[in-house]
Every structure is written in structure tokens, then in C-alpha cells.
Amino acid sequence: VAKKKDKVKKGGPGSECAEWAWGPCTPSSKDCGVGFREGTCGAQTQRIRCRVPCNWKKEFGADCKYKFENWGACDGGTGTKVRQGTLKKARYNAQCQETIRVTKPCTPKTKAKAKAKKGKGKD
């Protein structure tokens, strides 16, 4: 990640800026926590403080947005369920996967149901 400039250029009293384009929130250290977002409008630039939550994985953060299917059925063997996400929008310079798979543990209730189904199938 390129280091952002600390100075803030502001237009003179008569300057008007209709549309600011804001870049991503870039954490000051590592890949989460407090950082800065840089905005540009014409020749002006501004930096504002922002925060990237540390429980977000980078690929699921603001850089890459996905549209997710519903969760699949619980896999009794692994105790997990899966859903697929298709890329909806990426930050211009973010090299996002076109599709991603997310897994999560089944709830105890779904686990029990999946086991019961498995048991019935064996009979």
C-alpha cells in the first residue's frame, strides 16, 4: 500500500468542489485498525481518519463486495455448511476473486438433523 501524504491541500476561499472521489480506508499499520482515507477533487486532496474493523478479512472488506447465495445444507461429515459469493463490486485497483466460497460451522441443531438424516440413510 502506497503511503499517503500527510499534508492536506485545501482550495482557497473562492474554490468550489462539487464531487470528491474518496479512496479506500488504508490502515496505518498492518491490515486493519485506524488509518486514513484520501479524497481528491480537481487539484485538491484531503485525508480523513477512518477505521478498518479487525474482524474483517481483507478480501471481504471494502475492497471486494460479494453477492452471496443461501447457505447450503449442513455436511454431517465435516460439521460445516458452505455458500458461494459472486463478485458484485471491487475497488478499482483491488484484485478480487470472481467467486469465493465461505464455510461456517453448523449450529448444534442443524448438526443433529444432518446426523439423523445420515443415520436414516444407512438403514
Epitope: A2, K89, A90, Y92, N93, E98
Partner: antibody
Framework: QVQLQQPGAELVRPGHSVKLSCKAS????????MNWVRQRPGQGLEWIGM????????ILNQKFKDKATLTVDISSNTAYMQLSSPTSEDSAVYFC??????????WGQGTTLTVSS | EIVLTQSPATLSLSPGERANLSCRAS??????LHWYQQKPHQAPRLLIK???QSISGIPARFSGSGPGTDFNLTISSVEPEDFAVYYC?????????FGGGTKLEIK
């Protein structure tokens, strides 16, 4: 792979606005930024602006803020650029291109716009 | 806006020679620099993205270097089909800007 189709040529009278189209086929149109680029005869490339079909977020080169309006129609997988009050200065080839930082980009063949009475 | 200066404006080489094209940015743009090839009456074609990342379907003789302010596109051994105009483009900040181009011509 994305294919982008643009009309080969458009003729418009000075002062009459014109809407250029860019129709996408192939992979998902709505996931990628659509750029518009101008190339005047014998000149280099000039970025006009871009739009994201998923939410119509638009970033426009300030130089074109009073000239170009970018829109998309998701139902027909088509991006549009409307040029207001065209003059002979706007006679150029206009390209659209679909950008993905991961895979690169795909370009239309360009529309030659002639502004003439 | 970020200004990209390409040099030389024209490069005259014979097939088989090595080509070095330069692109200098007016400020640091990290690795957000891309190279395009354009032939007459055709759309530009992406050769290299993010300073040095190769593109599927582009011959291995094309390579790029960066990041920072000074970038280079190298064609290790020029082929007859490589004679064209080459543009660099930055995507570090809006507006996106292109260099003025380098014309690679047959000597």
C-alpha cells in the same frame, strides 16, 4: 470473456446532444467498472470517466463534467454516454472498456463521432 | 492531476532489437501503472498491468518494471507486429491519465 459492441459511427449536428452506447455480452457486465475514453484524430487517449453498473457510482474527469453523462441499463447490459451540446471539438473516436484489476480489461472497437452540420 | 511523461516520443528499431520505453509520473503512483499497445484504427490492447503483472495472451517478450515514479516497458526482441504506439496509464488517483505515447517504428 467480455465482448463490448459499439456502433461504428455516429453523425450529430452541432448543439444536438448524442447518446453513445456500449453493449456487453459474455461474462458478468455488472461486476466491473466501465470506462469511457476519447481519442481525437491523430491524438492520444483521454479518460472521460467511469461508472459501476452495480450501483451506478460514477467518477467523472472534471474536464468533462459539463459535457458527459454516464448511465447504465442493467436489463440490456448496456452502458451509455451522453454528450451535451457537441461542437466540432467533440469529433473523435469514443471507446468503452470494462476493467477488472484481476483479469485486465476488454475494449469496444470505438464509435467515430462526427459533429457536423 | 498526475502527469505521465513518455520517452522517447519515437523509437526507431529493427526487428530483433531490444526496445526500452519509459514512463515517468509527476508523483509516486505506487505500482498503479499500466501499459497499452495501439495500432491504427484499433482499440488499445492491455500489455502489462500494475507495473509488472503479465496479461493472459500477451507474448512473454513484453515485460514491465516499477513501482514509484519511473516505469519501463521492455520488448526483449521486437517482432514486426510490435510496431505501434505504446501508452502508459495510471490508476492511482482520479482522473485516470495517459502518457502522450511512444511510437515504435521500423528503422
Amino acid at each position: 470473456q467480455v465482448q463490448l459492441q459499439q456502433p461504428g459511427a455516429e453523425l450529430v449536428r452541432p448543439g444536438h446532444s448524442v447518446k453513445l452506447s456500449c453493449k456487453a455480452s459474455g461474462q458478468s457486465f455488472s461486476s466491473y467498472w466501465m470506462n469511457w475514453v476519447r481519442q481525437r484524430p491523430g491524438q492520444g487517449l483521454e479518460w472521460i470517466g467511469m461508472i459501476h453498473p452495480s450501483d451506478s457510482e460514477t467518477i467523472l474527469n472534471q474536464k468533462f463534467k459539463d459535457k458527459a453523462t454516464l448511465t447504465v441499463d442493467i436489463s440490456s447490459n448496456t452502458a451509455y454516454m451522453q454528450l451535451s451540446s457537441p461542437t466540432s471539438e467533440d469529433s473523435a473516436v469514443y471507446f468503452c472498456s470494462s476493467w477488472s484489476a484481476k483479469r485486465g480489461d476488454f475494449w469496444g472497437q470505438g464509435t467515430t463521432l462526427t459533429v457536423s452540420s | 492531476e498526475i502527469v505521465l511523461t513518455q520517452s522517447p516520443a519515437t523509437l526507431s528499431l529493427s526487428p530483433g532489437e531490444r526496445a526500452n520505453l519509459s514512463c515517468r509520473a509527476s508523483e509516486s503512483i505506487s505500482n498503479n501503472l499500466h501499459w497499452y499497445q495501439q495500432k491504427p484504427h484499433q482499440a488499445p490492447r492491455l500489455l502489462i498491468k500494475y507495473a509488472s503483472q503479465s496479461i493472459s495472451g500477451i507474448p512473454a517478450r513484453f515485460s514491465g518494471s516499477g513501482p514509484g515514479t519511473d516505469f519501463n516497458l521492455t520488448i526483449s526482441s521486437v517482432e514486426p507486429e510490435d510496431f505501434a504506439v505504446y501508452y502508459c496509464q495510471q490508476s492511482n488517483s482520479w482522473p485516470l491519465t495517459f502518457g502522450g505515447g511512444t511510437k515504435l517504428e521500423i528503422k
